[in-house]
Interface confidence: medium
Protein backbone atom coordinates (compact mmCIF):
# COMPACT_ATOMS: atom_id res chain seq x y z
CA UNK A 1 0.00 0.00 0.00
CA UNK A 2 3.17 2.48 0.76
CA UNK A 3 4.79 1.66 -2.58
CA UNK A 4 4.98 3.84 -5.22
CA UNK A 5 6.43 3.44 -8.60
CA UNK A 6 8.86 6.28 -10.01
CA UNK A 7 10.70 6.21 -13.39
CA UNK A 8 13.49 8.05 -15.20
CA UNK A 9 15.68 8.69 -17.83
CA UNK A 10 19.19 8.04 -17.65
CA UNK A 11 21.13 11.42 -17.61
CA UNK A 12 17.85 13.76 -16.22
CA UNK A 13 17.38 14.15 -12.63
CA UNK A 14 14.66 12.24 -10.96
CA UNK A 15 13.10 13.33 -7.83
CA UNK A 16 11.03 10.81 -5.69
CA UNK A 17 9.39 11.82 -2.48
CA UNK A 18 8.15 9.12 0.03
CA UNK A 19 5.16 7.91 0.03
CA UNK A 20 4.54 8.00 3.51
CA UNK A 21 3.82 11.48 4.60
CA UNK A 22 4.58 13.22 7.91
CA UNK A 23 5.35 16.76 9.39
CA UNK A 24 8.03 18.75 8.09
CA UNK A 25 9.50 18.73 11.12
CA UNK A 26 9.96 14.68 11.13
CA UNK A 27 12.73 13.55 9.81
CA UNK A 28 13.46 11.17 6.82
CA UNK A 29 15.97 9.07 6.29
CA UNK A 30 16.21 6.41 3.28
CA UNK A 31 17.81 3.56 2.65
CA UNK A 32 18.37 1.67 -0.57
CA UNK A 33 16.68 -1.51 0.37
CA UNK A 34 18.84 -4.19 -1.21
CA UNK A 35 21.84 -3.73 0.87
CA UNK A 36 19.93 -1.47 3.49
CA UNK A 37 22.51 0.98 2.80
CA UNK A 38 21.69 4.31 4.10
CA UNK A 39 21.69 7.34 1.58
CA UNK A 40 23.23 10.23 2.53
CA UNK A 41 21.92 13.57 2.92
CA UNK A 42 24.75 15.28 1.15
CA UNK A 43 24.14 17.69 -1.48
CA UNK A 44 27.33 16.40 -3.24
CA UNK A 45 26.45 13.18 -3.82
CA UNK A 46 24.49 12.49 -6.90
CA UNK A 47 22.19 10.64 -5.27
CA UNK A 48 21.41 12.04 -2.22
CA UNK A 49 18.35 12.55 0.60
CA UNK A 50 16.96 15.52 1.42
CA UNK A 51 13.69 14.97 4.03
CA UNK A 52 10.75 13.46 2.12
CA UNK A 53 12.75 13.61 -1.51
CA UNK A 54 15.07 11.59 -2.91
CA UNK A 55 17.44 12.96 -5.56
CA UNK A 56 19.17 11.68 -8.51
CA UNK A 57 20.90 14.34 -9.74
CA UNK A 58 21.34 12.49 -12.52
CA UNK A 59 19.86 9.63 -12.48
CA UNK A 60 21.70 6.29 -13.56
CA UNK A 61 20.45 2.98 -14.88
CA UNK A 62 22.33 1.56 -12.18
CA UNK A 63 20.30 3.31 -9.70
CA UNK A 64 17.14 1.42 -9.91
CA UNK A 65 15.85 -0.65 -7.35
CA UNK A 66 13.82 -0.44 -4.52
CA UNK A 67 14.30 2.79 -1.70
CA UNK A 68 13.17 2.91 1.82
CA UNK A 69 12.18 5.57 3.77
CA UNK A 70 11.16 5.63 7.39
CA UNK A 71 9.07 8.86 8.38
CA UNK A 72 10.35 9.23 11.98
CA UNK A 73 8.27 11.33 14.36
CA UNK A 74 8.44 11.25 18.26
CA UNK A 75 5.67 8.57 18.73
CA UNK A 76 5.89 6.76 15.87
CA UNK A 77 7.74 5.11 12.81
CA UNK A 78 6.57 5.05 9.19
CA UNK A 79 7.67 2.63 6.60
CA UNK A 80 7.27 3.39 3.05
CA UNK A 81 9.09 1.81 -0.22
CA UNK A 82 9.64 3.81 -3.73
CA UNK A 83 10.33 1.27 -6.66
CA UNK A 84 12.56 3.25 -8.88
CA UNK A 85 13.41 2.36 -12.54
CA UNK A 86 15.87 4.34 -14.56
CA UNK A 87 15.73 3.78 -18.14
CA UNK A 88 18.07 4.26 -21.06
CA UNK A 89 17.08 6.75 -23.37
CA UNK A 90 14.80 5.72 -26.35
CA UNK A 91 17.14 6.47 -29.79
CA UNK A 92 14.15 6.63 -31.62
CA UNK A 93 10.67 9.05 -31.19
CA UNK A 94 8.53 6.48 -29.30
CA UNK A 95 7.92 7.11 -26.17
CA UNK A 96 7.39 3.39 -24.41
CA UNK A 97 4.24 2.62 -22.27
CA UNK A 98 6.61 2.39 -19.28
CA UNK A 99 8.00 6.11 -19.36
CA UNK A 100 4.52 7.16 -20.10
CA UNK A 101 2.66 9.11 -17.11
CA UNK A 102 -1.77 8.68 -16.63
CA UNK A 103 -3.88 9.76 -19.63
CA UNK A 104 -5.82 12.67 -19.72
CA UNK A 105 -9.11 13.48 -21.24
CA UNK A 106 -9.77 16.74 -22.73
CA UNK A 107 -13.12 18.63 -24.76
CA UNK A 108 -13.46 21.72 -26.61
CA UNK A 109 -14.21 23.46 -23.31
CA UNK A 110 -11.10 21.94 -20.82
CA UNK A 111 -8.18 21.33 -22.98
CA UNK A 112 -5.33 21.59 -19.79
CA UNK A 113 -2.32 18.95 -19.71
CA UNK A 114 -0.47 19.14 -16.73
CA UNK A 115 3.43 18.37 -16.77
CA UNK A 116 3.50 15.18 -14.71
CA UNK A 117 5.82 15.34 -11.31
CA UNK A 118 6.46 18.88 -12.10
CA UNK A 119 5.79 20.08 -8.39
CA UNK A 120 9.03 18.35 -7.11
CA UNK A 121 11.33 20.23 -8.89
CA UNK A 122 12.93 23.64 -8.74
CA UNK A 123 12.13 24.45 -12.52
CA UNK A 124 11.88 28.36 -14.10
CA UNK A 125 9.56 29.00 -17.26
CA UNK A 126 9.97 28.16 -19.86
CA UNK A 127 8.35 24.73 -20.36
CA UNK A 128 9.06 23.20 -23.41
CA UNK A 129 6.05 21.04 -24.85
CA UNK A 130 6.29 18.65 -27.64
CA UNK A 131 3.85 16.63 -29.25
CA UNK A 132 4.88 13.03 -30.70
CA UNK A 133 8.28 14.69 -30.28
CA UNK A 134 7.11 17.58 -32.53
CA UNK A 135 8.00 21.17 -30.85
CA UNK A 136 4.44 22.48 -30.37
CA UNK A 137 3.92 25.93 -32.49
CA UNK A 138 1.30 28.13 -33.27
CA UNK A 139 -1.60 30.04 -31.44
CA UNK A 140 -3.72 27.01 -30.24
CA UNK A 141 -0.48 25.89 -27.77
CA UNK A 142 0.00 28.03 -24.67
CA UNK A 143 2.46 27.07 -21.88
CA UNK A 144 0.61 28.22 -18.49
CA UNK A 145 2.61 27.71 -15.40
CA UNK A 146 2.95 24.14 -15.19
CA UNK A 147 0.28 22.97 -17.93
CA UNK A 148 -0.27 23.28 -21.85
CA UNK A 149 -3.50 24.83 -22.66
CA UNK A 150 -4.96 23.46 -26.57
CA UNK A 151 -7.23 26.05 -27.84
CA UNK A 152 -10.35 24.53 -29.68
CA UNK A 153 -9.20 21.17 -29.59
CA UNK A 154 -10.07 18.98 -32.08
CA UNK A 155 -9.78 15.46 -33.03
CA UNK A 156 -6.19 15.41 -34.33
CA UNK A 157 -5.19 17.08 -30.30
CA UNK A 158 -5.12 13.57 -29.18
CA UNK A 159 -1.70 11.91 -28.55
CA UNK A 160 1.40 11.77 -26.75
CA UNK A 161 2.79 14.97 -25.17
CA UNK A 162 6.16 15.38 -23.55
CA UNK A 163 7.10 18.17 -21.47
CA UNK A 164 10.47 19.36 -20.87
CA UNK A 165 12.20 21.67 -18.13
CA UNK A 166 15.30 22.33 -16.15
CA UNK A 167 15.80 21.53 -12.98
CA UNK A 168 18.00 23.73 -10.85
CA UNK A 169 19.84 22.35 -7.83
CA UNK A 170 22.84 24.73 -6.09
CA UNK A 171 23.40 26.31 -9.50
CA UNK A 172 23.60 23.29 -11.46
CA UNK A 173 20.69 22.72 -14.45
CA UNK A 174 19.76 18.82 -15.01
CA UNK A 175 17.27 18.23 -17.93
CA UNK A 176 13.77 16.52 -17.12
CA UNK A 177 10.95 15.33 -19.42
CA UNK A 178 7.55 13.49 -18.70
CA UNK A 179 5.21 12.10 -21.23
CA UNK A 180 1.36 11.27 -20.52
CA UNK A 181 -1.27 10.85 -23.66
CA UNK A 182 -4.09 13.02 -23.99
CA UNK A 183 -7.44 11.41 -25.32
CA UNK A 184 -10.18 14.19 -27.01
CA UNK A 185 -13.26 13.74 -24.96
CA UNK A 186 -16.50 13.76 -27.87
CA UNK A 187 -19.02 15.99 -26.64
CA UNK A 188 -21.69 15.13 -29.25
CA UNK A 189 -20.00 11.99 -30.97
CA UNK A 190 -22.50 10.57 -33.17
CA UNK A 191 -22.93 7.57 -35.70
CA UNK A 192 -25.07 7.65 -39.07
CA UNK A 193 -25.32 5.27 -41.63
CA UNK A 194 -22.29 4.97 -43.77
CA UNK A 195 -21.80 7.99 -46.50
CA UNK A 196 -19.98 7.64 -49.12
CA UNK A 197 -18.35 10.37 -50.61
CA UNK A 198 -16.28 8.45 -53.15
CA UNK A 199 -16.47 7.03 -55.62
CA UNK A 200 -20.07 8.27 -56.89
CA UNK A 201 -22.83 6.04 -57.31
CA UNK A 202 -22.64 4.26 -60.82
CA UNK A 203 -18.96 6.00 -61.82
CA UNK A 204 -17.56 4.85 -64.43
CA UNK A 205 -13.26 5.44 -64.41
CA UNK A 206 -10.94 5.40 -67.52
CA UNK A 207 -8.25 3.14 -67.18
CA UNK A 208 -5.83 1.97 -69.85
CA UNK A 209 -4.65 -1.43 -71.04
CA UNK A 210 -1.08 -2.33 -69.61
CA UNK A 211 -0.93 0.47 -67.57
CA UNK A 212 -1.84 0.22 -63.29
CA UNK A 213 -5.17 2.24 -62.12
CA UNK A 214 -6.28 3.00 -58.72
CA UNK A 215 -10.07 3.00 -57.29
CA UNK A 216 -10.13 4.61 -53.76
CA UNK A 217 -13.36 3.73 -51.67
CA UNK A 218 -13.63 6.70 -49.28
CA UNK A 219 -16.53 6.75 -46.78
CA UNK A 220 -17.34 8.59 -43.26
CA UNK A 221 -19.57 6.89 -40.32
CA UNK A 222 -20.03 9.96 -38.08
CA UNK A 223 -18.45 11.71 -35.57
CA UNK A 224 -15.67 10.76 -32.58
CA UNK A 225 -15.63 7.16 -31.38
CA UNK A 226 -17.23 4.67 -34.51
CA UNK A 227 -17.70 1.66 -32.84
CA UNK A 228 -17.56 -1.00 -35.77
CA UNK A 229 -17.04 0.50 -39.09
CA UNK A 230 -15.21 -0.89 -42.29
CA UNK A 231 -14.93 0.09 -45.98
CA UNK A 232 -13.90 -2.84 -48.50
CA UNK A 233 -13.87 -3.22 -52.19
CA UNK A 234 -15.77 -6.58 -53.49
CA UNK A 235 -15.29 -7.59 -57.43
CA UNK A 236 -18.53 -9.03 -59.20
CA UNK A 237 -20.04 -9.32 -55.49
CA UNK A 238 -16.64 -11.49 -54.16
CA UNK A 239 -14.30 -10.68 -51.54
CA UNK A 240 -10.76 -9.21 -53.07
CA UNK A 241 -9.24 -12.10 -51.30
CA UNK A 242 -11.27 -14.76 -52.20
CA UNK A 243 -11.47 -13.56 -55.59
CA UNK A 244 -8.29 -15.00 -56.64
CA UNK A 245 -6.87 -12.30 -59.19
CA UNK A 246 -3.31 -11.37 -57.42
CA UNK A 247 -2.59 -8.43 -59.93
CA UNK A 248 -5.92 -6.50 -57.72
CA UNK A 249 -5.32 -5.97 -54.40
CA UNK A 250 -6.77 -3.56 -51.81
CA UNK A 251 -4.87 -1.88 -49.06
CA UNK A 252 -5.93 0.74 -46.25
CA UNK A 253 -5.17 4.63 -46.95
CA UNK A 254 -5.24 6.56 -44.64
CA UNK A 255 -6.92 4.05 -42.13
CA UNK A 256 -8.91 6.88 -40.18
CA UNK A 257 -9.26 10.50 -40.50
CA UNK A 258 -11.23 13.30 -39.04
CA UNK A 259 -11.54 16.09 -40.97
CA UNK A 260 -13.88 18.12 -39.76
CA UNK A 261 -14.24 16.03 -36.72
CA UNK A 262 -15.91 13.28 -38.86
CA UNK A 263 -14.50 9.60 -39.02
CA UNK A 264 -13.50 8.18 -42.18
CA UNK A 265 -12.05 5.52 -43.57
CA UNK A 266 -10.41 4.97 -47.16
CA UNK A 267 -9.41 1.33 -48.95
CA UNK A 268 -8.03 1.61 -52.12
CA UNK A 269 -7.61 -1.04 -54.81
CA UNK A 270 -4.86 -1.30 -57.12
CA UNK A 271 -5.25 -3.07 -60.04
CA UNK A 272 -2.00 -3.61 -61.69
CA UNK A 273 -1.67 -4.02 -65.50
CA UNK A 274 -4.99 -3.45 -66.51
CA UNK A 275 -6.23 -6.10 -68.62
CA UNK A 276 -9.32 -6.63 -71.21
CA UNK A 277 -10.98 -8.73 -68.87
CA UNK A 278 -11.16 -6.16 -65.74
CA UNK A 279 -13.39 -4.49 -68.05
CA UNK A 280 -15.99 -6.75 -67.46
CA UNK A 281 -15.91 -7.16 -63.83
CA UNK A 282 -18.35 -5.04 -61.58
CA UNK A 283 -16.38 -2.98 -58.85
CA UNK A 284 -18.28 -2.59 -55.44
CA UNK A 285 -17.01 -0.18 -53.04
CA UNK A 286 -19.09 -1.10 -49.40
CA UNK A 287 -19.28 0.91 -46.39
CA UNK A 288 -20.63 -0.83 -43.55
CA UNK A 289 -21.16 -0.31 -39.75
CA UNK A 290 -24.24 -1.35 -37.74
CA UNK A 291 -26.60 0.71 -38.85
CA UNK A 292 -26.19 -0.89 -42.02
CA UNK A 293 -24.10 -1.63 -45.40
CA UNK A 294 -24.00 1.13 -48.53
CA UNK A 295 -22.52 0.30 -51.92
CA UNK A 296 -21.23 2.43 -54.64
CA UNK A 297 -20.33 0.56 -58.10
CA UNK A 298 -17.69 1.26 -60.46
CA UNK A 299 -17.49 0.26 -63.64
CA UNK A 300 -13.58 0.65 -65.31
CA UNK A 301 -13.96 1.50 -69.56
CA UNK A 302 -10.76 1.68 -71.61
CA UNK A 303 -9.11 5.15 -72.22
CA UNK A 304 -8.94 6.00 -75.87
CA UNK A 305 -5.42 6.37 -76.40
CA UNK A 306 -4.66 10.46 -77.24
CA UNK A 307 -4.47 11.08 -80.54
CA UNK A 308 -1.38 12.75 -81.97
CA UNK A 309 -1.26 15.44 -84.04
CA UNK A 310 1.33 15.49 -86.59
CA UNK B 1 -13.92 -4.61 -19.39
CA UNK B 2 -15.87 -5.32 -16.34
CA UNK B 3 -18.20 -7.95 -15.15
CA UNK B 4 -15.83 -10.78 -14.51
CA UNK B 5 -16.40 -12.67 -11.13
CA UNK B 6 -16.50 -15.55 -9.08
CA UNK B 7 -19.03 -17.89 -10.06
CA UNK B 8 -19.73 -21.91 -9.99
CA UNK B 9 -20.10 -23.96 -12.51
CA UNK B 10 -23.12 -23.17 -14.81
CA UNK B 11 -23.51 -20.26 -13.28
CA UNK B 12 -23.69 -16.98 -16.12
CA UNK B 13 -21.69 -13.70 -16.13
CA UNK B 14 -22.11 -10.73 -18.48
CA UNK B 15 -18.42 -8.92 -19.08
CA UNK B 16 -18.88 -5.65 -20.84
CA UNK B 17 -16.26 -3.53 -22.77
CA UNK B 18 -16.48 0.35 -23.42
CA UNK B 19 -14.38 1.65 -26.93
CA UNK B 20 -13.15 4.91 -26.52
CA UNK B 21 -10.98 7.80 -27.57
CA UNK B 22 -10.70 8.45 -31.61
CA UNK B 23 -10.61 5.42 -33.18
CA UNK B 24 -12.73 3.40 -36.14
CA UNK B 25 -12.49 -0.05 -34.93
CA UNK B 26 -12.94 -2.59 -37.73
CA UNK B 27 -13.92 -5.51 -35.47
CA UNK B 28 -13.57 -6.23 -31.78
CA UNK B 29 -13.59 -9.43 -29.73
CA UNK B 30 -13.20 -11.15 -26.72
CA UNK B 31 -9.59 -13.00 -26.00
CA UNK B 32 -8.97 -15.17 -22.84
CA UNK B 33 -5.98 -15.95 -21.04
CA UNK B 34 -5.99 -19.29 -18.90
CA UNK B 35 -2.69 -19.70 -16.68
CA UNK B 36 0.12 -20.71 -18.21
CA UNK B 37 -1.68 -20.83 -21.17
CA UNK B 38 -1.72 -19.21 -24.51
CA UNK B 39 -4.34 -16.06 -25.02
CA UNK B 40 -7.08 -17.72 -27.43
CA UNK B 41 -10.24 -16.09 -29.09
CA UNK B 42 -13.18 -16.52 -27.33
CA UNK B 43 -15.72 -14.34 -29.77
CA UNK B 44 -15.43 -12.01 -32.53
CA UNK B 45 -17.87 -9.31 -33.71
CA UNK B 46 -17.56 -7.03 -36.77
CA UNK B 47 -19.85 -4.86 -38.28
CA UNK B 48 -22.07 -7.36 -39.84
CA UNK B 49 -21.07 -11.09 -38.12
CA UNK B 50 -20.17 -12.78 -34.79
CA UNK B 51 -17.98 -15.59 -34.31
CA UNK B 52 -17.46 -17.77 -31.50
CA UNK B 53 -14.59 -20.58 -30.64
CA UNK B 54 -16.30 -24.01 -30.85
CA UNK B 55 -15.25 -24.27 -26.97
CA UNK B 56 -18.05 -21.68 -26.30
CA UNK B 57 -20.82 -21.81 -29.20
CA UNK B 58 -24.00 -22.02 -27.84
CA UNK B 59 -23.37 -20.87 -24.29
CA UNK B 60 -21.47 -17.36 -24.85
CA UNK B 61 -23.47 -14.29 -27.03
CA UNK B 62 -21.34 -11.70 -28.36
CA UNK B 63 -23.58 -8.26 -28.86
CA UNK B 64 -23.00 -4.73 -29.48
CA UNK B 65 -24.48 -1.21 -28.71
CA UNK B 66 -23.44 1.38 -30.84
CA UNK B 67 -25.29 4.33 -29.13
CA UNK B 68 -22.68 3.15 -25.81
CA UNK B 69 -19.56 2.08 -27.91
CA UNK B 70 -20.13 -0.82 -25.86
CA UNK B 71 -19.27 -4.62 -26.33
CA UNK B 72 -20.86 -7.63 -24.37
CA UNK B 73 -19.87 -10.90 -23.70
CA UNK B 74 -23.05 -13.20 -21.93
CA UNK B 75 -21.78 -16.04 -20.42
CA UNK B 76 -23.93 -18.78 -19.79
CA UNK B 77 -23.77 -22.72 -18.55
CA UNK B 78 -19.82 -21.51 -17.09
CA UNK B 79 -17.24 -24.16 -16.74
CA UNK B 80 -14.40 -24.54 -14.69
CA UNK B 81 -12.43 -24.31 -18.17
CA UNK B 82 -13.81 -21.44 -18.91
CA UNK B 83 -11.77 -19.66 -15.80
CA UNK B 84 -8.35 -17.09 -17.37
CA UNK B 85 -8.11 -14.06 -17.72
CA UNK B 86 -10.71 -12.14 -20.41
CA UNK B 87 -9.37 -9.33 -22.47
CA UNK B 88 -11.84 -7.39 -24.79
CA UNK B 89 -9.53 -6.26 -28.39
CA UNK B 90 -10.12 -3.80 -31.12
CA UNK B 91 -9.10 -4.05 -34.54
CA UNK B 92 -8.02 -1.39 -36.60
CA UNK B 93 -6.38 -2.93 -38.62
CA UNK B 94 -7.39 -5.55 -41.36
CA UNK B 95 -6.05 -8.63 -40.60
CA UNK B 96 -7.18 -12.46 -39.26
CA UNK B 97 -10.14 -12.67 -37.39
CA UNK B 98 -8.91 -15.19 -34.70
CA UNK B 99 -5.08 -13.67 -34.61
CA UNK B 100 -4.20 -11.53 -31.01
CA UNK B 101 -1.30 -9.87 -32.78
CA UNK B 102 -4.06 -8.41 -35.62
CA UNK B 103 -5.49 -6.18 -32.66
CA UNK B 104 -4.16 -3.29 -32.13
CA UNK B 105 -6.18 -2.09 -28.73
CA UNK B 106 -6.30 -4.29 -25.72
CA UNK B 107 -8.41 -3.47 -21.98
CA UNK B 108 -6.70 -4.71 -18.51
CA UNK B 109 -8.39 -7.77 -18.80
CA UNK B 110 -11.26 -8.98 -16.09
CA UNK B 111 -10.82 -11.87 -14.43
CA UNK B 112 -13.34 -15.13 -14.67
CA UNK B 113 -12.92 -17.85 -11.89
CA UNK B 114 -15.53 -20.69 -12.49
CA UNK B 115 -15.47 -23.41 -9.87
CA UNK B 116 -16.78 -26.53 -9.47
Known amino acids: KFSKQSWGLENEALIVRCPRQGKPSYTVDWYYSQTNKSIPTQERNRVFASGQLLKFLPAAVADSGIYTCIVRSPTFNRTGYANVTIYKKQSDCNVPDYLMYSTVSGSEKNSKIYCPTIDLYNWTAPLEWFKNCQALQGSRYRAHKSFLVIDNVMTEDAGDYTCKFIHNENGANYSVTATRSFTVKDEQGFSLFPVIGAPAQNEIKEVEIGKNANLTCSACFGKGTQFLAAVLWQLNGTKITDFGEPRIQQEEGQNQSFSNGLACLDMVLRIADVKEEDLLLQYDCLALNLHGLRRHTVRLSRKNPSKECF | ESGGGSVQAGGSLRLSCAASGYTINYRMGWFRQAPGKEREGVAMASAISEDYADSVKGRFSISRDSAKNTLYLQMNSLKPEDTGMYYC?????????????????WGQGTQVTVSS
Open chain 2, 89 to 105: AAGRVWGRLWNPDDYNS
